[in-house]
Every structure is written in C-alpha cells, then in structure tokens.
C-alpha cells in the first residue's frame, strides 16, 4: 500500500514513515499491515486467500530385487544412482499413472537388502474445502497400487521380466504428511501484534481475515459517522465533528448540537 506525497512537506514526511515504512523519494512504502501517508493506519483486512494447491507427502519403503546393491548407490551423484533413479522414477510413474493427484517420487536413501528404496511419493490437489478427503483418498490408492505392483512384479528363476521386480514383504508406508492449511492460524500470524483483534469469517467458502474495522461482516464495529481505527488496545471509533454537531461515545452515537452548547455558553456570559 502506498500514499503519494506532493509539495514542500515531502522532505519532512521521509523521516516520519512509521511502522517500518520506507521512503522511496515520493512516498512512504508501507509494510503489508499498514497504510496511510505515514503508514500510520492499520489495515482492516488481510489477504489469507487459501493456497492454490495443497500437497501431501508419503514416506514409503520398497525393496527392489532386480538390482544388486553396490556401494556406489549411496552416492547420489554417481552414474549408478542416477541410472537407478531414472528407472525407479519411470516405474513409479507407470504404477501411479491413474492417480490425478500424483506428482512424482523423490528417493531419499538407498540401502543394502537387495536395494531398499526409501522414498517420498508426492501428491498435490487444488484447494477446496474438501482437500483433506481428496488427499486421503489418493493416499489410499497409492497404498493399493504399490502393494499390487510389489506383489505382481517378482523375480522368477532369479530373473526379472519386468522393468523392476520387488520383494512382496518389503513394502511399508512410514508416514503421511499433509500440508495443513489453517486460516485462523495464518490470520493470527499475519496480523502480528494485532492478532487478538483479527478474526476469520467465511463468504462463499472463502476465508477472510478481518478486524472489526472492516465493514460488512458480523463482527464489524459500527462507528456510525465516526471512523474505526485499530490500535494495540483494539478497535476504536474516532468520532467526527461536523459543522453542526460534535459526536462522542464508544460508537460515536451521541451527537451534541453545537448551537445548544454555544447558546448555553452565552447564558453564562
């Protein structure tokens, strides 16, 4: 958020940018949470729009029997490792080809025991409120498919007739991690020291991180003719003075006619 300054006062403005704002020669460039000529105002809504995609990572172990382990396989930059990685990746791409959420595999470690392959299966889906269900289903299909292939593609008479062969009993799912999307947590974090006063409200299944100074939500503070302003002690109404009235009260709902006050004063004189 930026506010441009014109005229003689600009030089003074430069040294007065508040809340971490920086002067760019024309205006104060404000950090995300602030706006105003001097970055003195706190925004009333923060964009915590959900991520476009949500990821999951499955830690799996399979035992490849069609390759004999050699020490070179421990070195990720060796020709042996690179060739193994290429074949293993191609094989897994075939195994998981029917899973729309499948992104790829990442080998973390190869160790002795024919070749024990510790790897991650990476999944990704577009964000929807049902993303957990979608990814849970995908992880189940991954388990089914890897179990099936490691049961079917096995050595016969010491030779593998498939791209890779496996030990049926060597397939294990160690861990499943789904990227957690927590709008409330994100809202609190992004609001920093104002976190206690920002809340998440939903519209059309989309989360909005707002303070009571944002109009149009159930938590919105009605300042009537006044202006809602956020401070470290919470939202406050700054009441206005018009040509005819002074306004006061917590929500600027108490108006006092100036003429009455002036008239009253005249009586005292």
């Amino acid at each position: 958020r930026t506010t441009t300054c014109f005229g003689d006062g600009c030089q003074n403005t430069a040294s007065r940018c508040k809340n971490g704002g920086t002067w760019d020669g024309l205006k104060c460039q404000c950090p995300n949470l602030y706006y105003g000529e001097l970055c003195e105002e706190v925004v009333s809504s923060i964009d915590i729009g959900p991520p476009e995609t949500i990821s999951a990572q499955m830690e799996l172990t399979v035992t490849v029997t069609s390759v004999k382990f050699t020490e070179e396989l421990k070195n990720h930059s060796s020709q042996e490792f690179q060739e193994f990685k290429q074949t293993f990746t191609e094989q897994m791409n075939i195994v998981y080809s029917g899973i729309p959420e499948y992104v790829g595999v990442n080998i973390t470690k190869l160790r002795l025991g024919s070749v024990v392959v510790e790897h991650d299966v990476l999944l990704r889906t577009k964000y929807t409120p049902e993303y957990k269900t979608v990814l849970d289903n995908a992880t189940e299909v991954v388990k089914e498919k890897i179990t099936k292939v490691t049961t079917q593609q096995i050595m016969i008479n010491d030779i593998c007739s498939d791209m890779m062969c496996f030990n049926t009993t060597g397939t294990q799912v160690q861990n499943i991690t789904v990227t957690q999307y927590d709008p409330e947590e994100d809202c609190r974090k992004m609001a920093k020291e104002y976190g206690d006063y920002f809340v998440v409200e939903y519209r059309d299944q989309k989360p909005y991180c707002i303070s009571p100074c944002e109009p149009g939500f159930s938590v919105s503070k009605n300042c009537n003719l006044g202006k809602c302003q956020m401070s470290l002690s919470g939202p406050q109404c700054l009441c206005v003075t018009t040509e005819t009235h002074w306004y006061s009260g917590e929500t600027c709902n108490q108006g006092t006619q100036k003429s009455l006050v002036y008239g009253h004063h005249h009586h005292h004189h």
């Epitope: 029997t65 069609s66 390759v67 004999k68 050699t70 070179e72 060796s78 020709q79 042996e80 060739e83 193994f84 290429q86 074949t87 191609e90 050595m155 010491d158 030779i159 593998c160 007739s161 498939d162 791209m163 890779m164 062969c165």
Partner: nanobody, 123 residues
C-alpha cells in the same frame, strides 16, 4: 558419451553357429551389467542373455543350453556364442549396458544401447 557397437551378424543355416561381439567405448560397465536383446520383425524386443560384474549370468528359456554370454573386461567387449541356431532366432540383435548390477531382461530396465547386428537363420 557411452557407445556400443555390435558386429558378427550374418546369414547362417539352421543348426549352424555365430559369434556376436559388442565393443564398449570404455570400461565403465565392468562394474555393472551387459546383455543381449533381439527383435524380430513385427515383434517386441526381448531379452536373450545377461552378464553382471559379479560373474552372474542369466538366459531366456528359449536360448538356454544353446547360447553363451561372456565378456572380456580387458578389451571392453561382450560376446554371444550362438549354437544350434533355428529359424526363430532370426532377428536384429542388440547389445545393452547398465551401470547397475542388474537381474532384469526387460528392455525398459536398460539405458544404453547399440545400433544392432542382423542375424538371419535360413536354408
């Protein structure tokens, strides 16, 4: 860049013999595996024989007892001695290599290939 060049193919009568050779550009495969594959017209490429750096050899059922695979690491060469040849052995024969110690006779498991040498068994 790895290069494999096959030679020794030709026309032979049923029951005859041939010896195929494959020259590798360097000795990198002496710690991995080498193999022979073949492809007849209109058919898929199939594994024939495999030899690994640990001395292990394996053969397709169709050639067991008739073909012998061997290698000479000093010459960076692979050989296939083919005896008792049959008409069904007619195919283009390819040499394949891997840095891995493989036990697989599926072409998808192999990354480095020669251009092939034609073997025709006919009377």
């Amino acid at each position: 860049d790895v290069q494999l060049v096959e030679s020794g193919g030709g026309l032979v009568q049923p029951g005859g013999s041939l010896r195929l050779s494959c020259a590798a550009s360097d000795n990198t495969f002496s710690r991995g595996s080498m193999s022979w594959f073949r492809q007849a017209p209109g058919k898929e490429r199939e594994g024939v024989a495999i030899i690994s750096s640990d001395g292990w050899t394996g053969y397709a059922d169709s050639v067991k007892g008739r073909f012998t695979i061997s290698q000479d690491n000093a010459k960076n060469s692979l050989y296939l001695q083919m005896n008792s040849l049959r008409a069904e052995d007619t195919a283009m024969y390819y040499c394949a290599a891997s840095f891995l110690v493989l036990r697989a006779l599926n072409p998808k498991a192999w990354h480095y290939w020669g251009q092939g040498t034609q073997v025709t068994v006919s009377s």
